[in-house]
């Protein structure tokens, strides 16, 4: 792939299959549109980054709550 199409930040190979505890999640970001699949990356209190499926309702709910805060 040409350098111009490189993803500038993290991408996700796949998604977590478990719903994260709401109080574990402190921040989020959406991966670049240059990644091969869309993803939301949640950052946890322990500093871990967790790839999640943006089409899942719990993911959308958490994103909404984080935006409110």
């Amino acid at each position: 792939a040409p350098m111009g199409s490189d993803p500038p930040t993290a991408c996700c190979f796949s998604y977590t299959a478990r719903k994260l505890p709401h109080n574990f999640v402190v921040d989020y970001y959406e991966t670049s549109s240059l990644c091969s699949q869309p993803a939301v990356v949640f950052q946890t209190k322990r500093g871990k980054q967790v790839c999640a499926d943006p089409s899942e309702s719990w993911v959308q709910e958490y994103v909404y709550d984080l935006e409110l805060n």
């Epitope: 792939a1 991408c11 190979f13 977590t16 299959a17 980054q49 967790v50």
Partner: antibody
Framework: QVQLKESGPGLVAPSQSLSITCTVS????????IHWVRQPPGKGLEWLGV???????NYNSALMSRLSISKDNSKSQVFLKMNSLQTDDTAMYYC??????????????WGQGTSVTVSS | QAVVTQESALTTSPGETVTLTCRSN?????????ANWVQEKPDHLFTGLIG???NRAPGVPARFSGSLIGDKAALTITGAQTEDEAIYFC?????????FGGGTKLTVLG
């Protein structure tokens, strides 16, 4: 702590199938993928495939027709099945943990491997 | 399927800097290949060192660093130690599968 352990038959007759189990501890299969990799005697590594938390898989295209990866999250076990074994499938077979994000090491923790010899 | 090529063997001395490289026959290695480096020590002990081209795994010494140099991925050991003697494998991601290089046997003459 994170641990992975492979268990297999050791010896397999030509044309028969191979089943290997990877039992993990210290993390959940709902949060990580599991990769399978093999190493023939005195040679390099060959990636076989991966199963992701939701059960989706990717395979080495050269082996896809003979390969199947499945898992049981509740038992923390992942299963590799390979059909129609030949002598050049003789190798050490490893499972490795696969984080989901591309900025981490993609096969970070490895099992100690299980030796498979294909011979009559 | 892509072919990934590494130096078969390199020799260095303690305290020296050594660079191992990883080439793809499909063209330049880019950040989209998420180059990984894995260390093999005797008795089949494998450890993931570097992921996503340049991200060190937790606990990996800072002397190990990953980068792109020209059209290749690279692993640089700055101030090699005798315990770094091992075989190093790179792995490149091609959209839906990984391909390993043949490995570089690094000897640290001490």
């Amino acid at each position: 702590q994170v641990q992975l352990k492979e268990s297999g038959p050791g010896l397999v007759a030509p044309s028969q199938s191979l089943s290997i189990t990877c039992t993990v501890s210290g993390f959940s299969l709902t949060g990580y993928g599991i990769h399978w990799v093999r190493q023939p005697p005195g040679k390099g590594l060959e990636w076989l495939g991966v199963i992701w938390p939701g059960g989706g898989t990717n395979y080495n295209s050269a082996l896809m027709s003979r390969l199947s990866i499945s898992k049981d999250n509740s038992k923390s076990q992942v299963f590799l099945k390979m059909n129609s074994l030949q002598t050049d499938d003789t190798a050490m077979y490893y499972c490795a943990r696969g984080p989901l994000i591309t900025t981490e090491v993609s096969m970070d923790y490895w099992g100690q491997g299980t030796s498979v010899t294909v011979s009559s | 399927q892509a072919v990934v090529t590494q130096e078969s063997a390199l020799t260095t001395s303690p305290g020296e800097t050594v660079t191992l490289t990883c080439r793809s026959n499909t063209g330049a290695v880019t950040t989209s290949n998420y180059a990984n480096w894995v260390q093999e020590k005797p008795d089949h002990l494998f450890t993931g060192l570097i992921g996503g081209t340049n991200n060190r795994a937790p606990g990996v010494p800072a002397r190990f660093s990953g980068s792109l140099i020209g059209d290749k991925a690279a692993l640089t050991i700055t101030g090699a130690q005798t315990e770094d003697e091992a075989i190093y494998f790179c792995a490149l991601w091609y959209s839906n599968h990984w391909v390993f290089g043949g490995g570089t046997k690094l000897t640290v003459l001490g």
